[in-house]
C-alpha cells in the first residue's frame, strides 16, 4: 500500500510581503518563508513575529496559517517638556514614514540638539534627521528683560515686573539672593549658602516676585548645594561661588527667566567704567531690608584701584584676588549691601541683546556705599568650566 502526499496550496503572499522561495509547487516537507517590505512587520493575529516559515504537511496543508505584514507604528510621540508636537503627515498619523515636528514654546524656549523634525522609521522609533531617537530639548532663553539698556548711573530704583526675572530670593538662616540658570539651577555666593551645604532642603527659594514679603511667588526647593572647592569659609572670599540644584524645573515666563552665562567675548562688555546692574532686597540707606526689589547701575572699577582700596586695615593684604571684580562709585552712595549677597551683577551683551551675569555679590566695606570703597563681586567668567562641569555632571 502506497500513497502520494498531497501538494500544499500555492502560498499567496500577504499585502506588503513576499514568499521565498518561489516554487512551481510545494509538496511534503517543502517550506516557504514570508518577508515583509521595509516598514512592515510580521503579525500573527495581534502578536509580532520575528520570522515566519511554514512547512507543507502530509495531508496537503500548511502547518501554520499565513501571517500579515502590518505597517510599523511608532505610536504617539512622547510629549516634549516646554514644547509641543505637530502631526505633519496627517492628524494622529504615527505609522511608517509619518512625519512629526517638535517645537518649543515661543519666546521663552529654544530648541537644542536638532531641528525637531522626526520620521517614523522601520525600527518603530521616531528618528530625527540626524538619526537621534531621543527627544530634542527645549532650553530656556536666557537674559531676557523688560529693561533694554544699562542706562546712566543711578541707585535705589524700584524694579518693575520683568526687569530682573532671574532674581531669586533665598531664605534659610539669612536673607540672600541668587540668579536662575537654565530652569533648574541657581547661581549664588558660597558664603550665602555655606551653612546649608549639608541641608539643602532647608533653603526656601522664591522667584517671580518683586516684593520680598509677598505671598505671591513661585516656590522652589533645593536638591543639592555645590560650594566651590576653593572656597574657605571665614578666610576671605576667594572662590565665593556656589550652585544650587533645584528639585524641579521651573516654568519660564516673563517674570521667571534665567540669566545668561558670559560668553568668551563677555569681557569686552565688562571693562573699567562699563555699567553693570546689581539687584536685590538687601539693606537700603535706611538700614532695613528692602520690601521691593531694588536695583542700582554701577560702573566697573579698575582692578588695581580696587585692590589698593582694600589693602589698608582692617582688610588683610590680598583680600581682592584675580577671581573678583569691583564696581561702584569713588564718591560712594551706590552699592550692593548685606542681604544682596549671591545676587547677580549683570551686563547687557549688545551683540546678542541678552543680559549676562558678570559678577556675584560677594563682599565689601562694612559700611555699604562708602566713599573710596567698592562692592566686590565674584568674577563669574573665571568659573565657567566649573559651572559647566557641575551642571553637566548633575
Amino acid at each position: 500500500y502506497t500513497s502520494t502526499a498531497q501538494p500544499c496550496p500555492y502560498p499567496m503572499a500577504p499585502p506588503n510581503g513576499h514568499v521565498s522561495p518561489v516554487q512551481a509547487k510545494y509538496i511534503l516537507k517543502d517550506s516557504f518563508s514570508i518577508f515583509c517590505e521595509t516598514g512592515y512587520e510580521l503579525l500573527q493575529g495581534h502578536l509580532p513575529l520575528k520570522s515566519f516559515t511554514a512547512v507543507c504537511q502530509k495531508d496537503g496543508s500548511w502547518d501554520r496559517p499565513m501571517p500579515a505584514c502590518s505597517i510599523v507604528d511608532c505610536g504617539p510621540p512622547d510629549d516634549l517638556p516646554s514644547g509641543r508636537v505637530e502631526y505633519i503627515t496627517g492628524p494622529g498619523v504615527t505609522t511608517y514614514k509619518a512625519v512629526i515636528q517638535y517645537s518649543c514654546e515661543e519666546t521663552f524656549y529654544t530648541m537644542k540638539v536638532n531641528d525637531g523634525k522626526y520620521v517614523c522609521e522601520a525600527d518603530g522609533f521616531w528618528t530625527s534627521s540626524k538619526g537621534e531617537k531621543s527627544l530634542p530639548v527645549c532650553e530656556p532663553v536666557c537674559g531676557l528683560s523688560a529693561r533694554t539698556t544699562g542706562g546712566r548711573i543711578y541707585g535705589g530704583q524700584k524694579a518693575k515686573p520683568g526687569d530682573f526675572p532671574w532674581q531669586v530670593l533665598i531664605l534659610g538662616g539669612t536673607t540672600a539672593a541668587g540668579a536662575l540658570l537654565y530652569d533648574n539651577w541657581v547661581l549664588t555666593a558660597a558664603h550665602a549658602v555655606y551653612e546649608q551645604k549639608h541641608d539643602a532642603s532647608a533653603l526656601d527659594i522664591r522667584m517671580g516676585t518683586l516684593k520680598r514679603l509677598s505671598p505671591h511667588y513661585t516656590q522652589a526647593w533645593s536638591e543639592a548645594v555645590f560650594i566651590h572647592e576653593g572656597y574657605t569659609h571665614d578666610a576671605g572670599f576667594d572662590n565665593d561661588i556656589a550652585l544650587i540644584k533645584l528639585n524641579n524645573k521651573v516654568v519660564i515666563n516673563s517674570n521667571i527667566t534665567p540669566i545668561c552665562l558670559p560668553r568668551k567675548e563677555a569681557e569686552s562688555f565688562m571693562r573699567t567704567d562699563d555699567i553693570g546692574t546689581a539687584s536685590g532686597w538687601g539693606l537700603t540707606q535706611r538700614g532695613f531690608l528692602a520690601r521691593n526689589l531694588m536695583y542700582v547701575d554701577i560702573p566697573i572699577v579698575d582692578h588695581q584701584k580696587c585692590t589698593a582700596a582694600y589693602e589698608k586695615p582692617p582688610y588683610p593684604r590680598g583680600s581682592v584676588t584675580a577671581n573678583m571684580l569691583c564696581a561702584g562709585l569713588e564718591s560712594g552712595g551706590k552699592d550692593s549691601c548685606r542681604g544682596d549677597s549671591g545676587g547677580a551683577l549683570v551686563f547687557l551683551d549688545s551683540e546678542t541683546e541678552r543680559w549676562f551675569v558678570g559678577g556675584i555679590v560677594s563682599w565689601g566695606s562694612m559700611n555699604c556705599g562708602e566713599a573710596g570703597q567698592y562692592g566686590v563681586y565674584t568674577k563669574v567668567i573665571n568659573y565657567i568650566p566649573w559651572i559647566e562641569n557641575i551642571i553637566s555632571d548633575f
Partner: antibody, heavy 116, light 111 residues
C-alpha cells in the same frame, strides 16, 4: 475642566461667507491639534478640517477643500473656520473637537444655515 | 477614502440586555501596534461623547459596561447590560488617514 465654545453660526445665502470661532479653555490649547466636524440636520457626523497644534499642518475634507480655511490663534486660545462660497449642503451644526488622534472633547456646536 | 459601515442601522433592546454593535471598514485600519477605530455616543440635541478609543480603550469616566474589540476591518462595541441612559445613536470613526470618516450610526432604541 476642558471647554470648547463655538460661535459665529447663522443664516447666510448661497455663495455667502461666514466665520466660525471656537474658544478653548481648561487645557494647553497650543499643545493640541483641533478639528471641525459637522452634522447636517437628521444626518450623521462628517469630519471637515484639522489644524495641527502650531498651525503648520492643515487638512480638509474634499467637500470643503478650496472653500473653507481652518486657522488658529494660540495666543487667544481660539480656533477659526472661514467658510466661503457656501452651499445649501453646508447647512449643519458645526462642532470643534479637541485632540490629534481622536475626538476626546467636543463643543456644543453652532448652527449654520445656508438658504436663499 | 475609507468607508465605515455600521450594522444594524437600528437595534431595539430592553434595559438589562446585551447590545452588540458592529463596524466594518473598507480596508484595514490596524497597524502593528494600534487599531484606529473609536466609538462615540450621541444623544438628541447633544454633542457626541467619546466612549472607546483605539478599538478597546475605555475613555475615563465611561462606565465599564462599555467595551470594544476587533482588529483589521471588523470592530465591535458591546454594552454588557443596557441602562436606560444608554439608548442613543452610536458612531464608529477611524483615524487611519485623512479624511477621517464616521460610520452612518447605529440607533439603539428601547424595545
Amino acid at each position: 475642566q476642558v471647554q470648547l465654545v463655538e460661535s459665529g453660526g447663522g443664516v447666510v445665502q448661497p455663495g455667502g461667507s461666514l466665520r466660525l470661532s471656537c474658544a478653548a479653555s481648561g487645557f494647553t490649547f497650543s499643545n493640541f491639534g483641533i478639528h471641525w466636524v459637522r452634522q447636517a440636520p437628521g444626518k450623521g457626523l462628517e469630519w471637515v478640517a484639522y489644524i495641527s497644534s502650531g498651525g503648520s499642518a492643515v487638512f480638509y475634507a474634499d467637500t470643503v477643500k478650496g472653500r473653507f480655511t481652518i486657522s488658529r490663534d494660540n495666543s487667544k486660545n481660539t480656533l477659526y473656520l472661514q467658510m466661503n462660497s457656501l452651499r445649501a449642503e453646508d447647512t449643519a451644526v458645526y462642532y470643534c473637537a479637541k485632540s490629534d488622534r481622536y475626538f476626546d472633547y467636543w463643543g456644543q456646536g453652532t448652527t449654520v444655515t445656508v438658504s436663499s | 477614502e475609507i468607508v465605515l459601515t455600521q450594522s444594524p442601522a437600528t437595534l431595539s433592546l430592553s434595559p438589562g440586555e446585551r447590545a452588540t454593535l458592529s463596524c466594518r471598514a473598507s480596508q484595514s485600519v490596524s497597524s502593528s501596534s494600534y487599531r484606529y477605530i473609536h466609538w462615540y455616543q450621541q444623544k438628541p440635541g447633544q454633542a457626541p461623547r467619546l466612549l472607546i478609543y483605539y478599538a478597546s480603550n475605555l475613555e475615563s469616566g465611561i462606565p465599564a459596561r462599555f467595551s470594544g474589540s476587533g482588529s483589521g476591518t471588523d470592530f465591535t462595541l458591546t454594552i454588557s447590560s443596557l441602562e436606560p441612559e444608554d439608548f442613543a445613536v452610536y458612531y464608529c470613526q477611524h483615524s487611519w488617514e485623512t479624511p477621517w470618516t464616521f460610520g452612518q450610526g447605529t440607533k439603539l432604541e428601547i424595545k
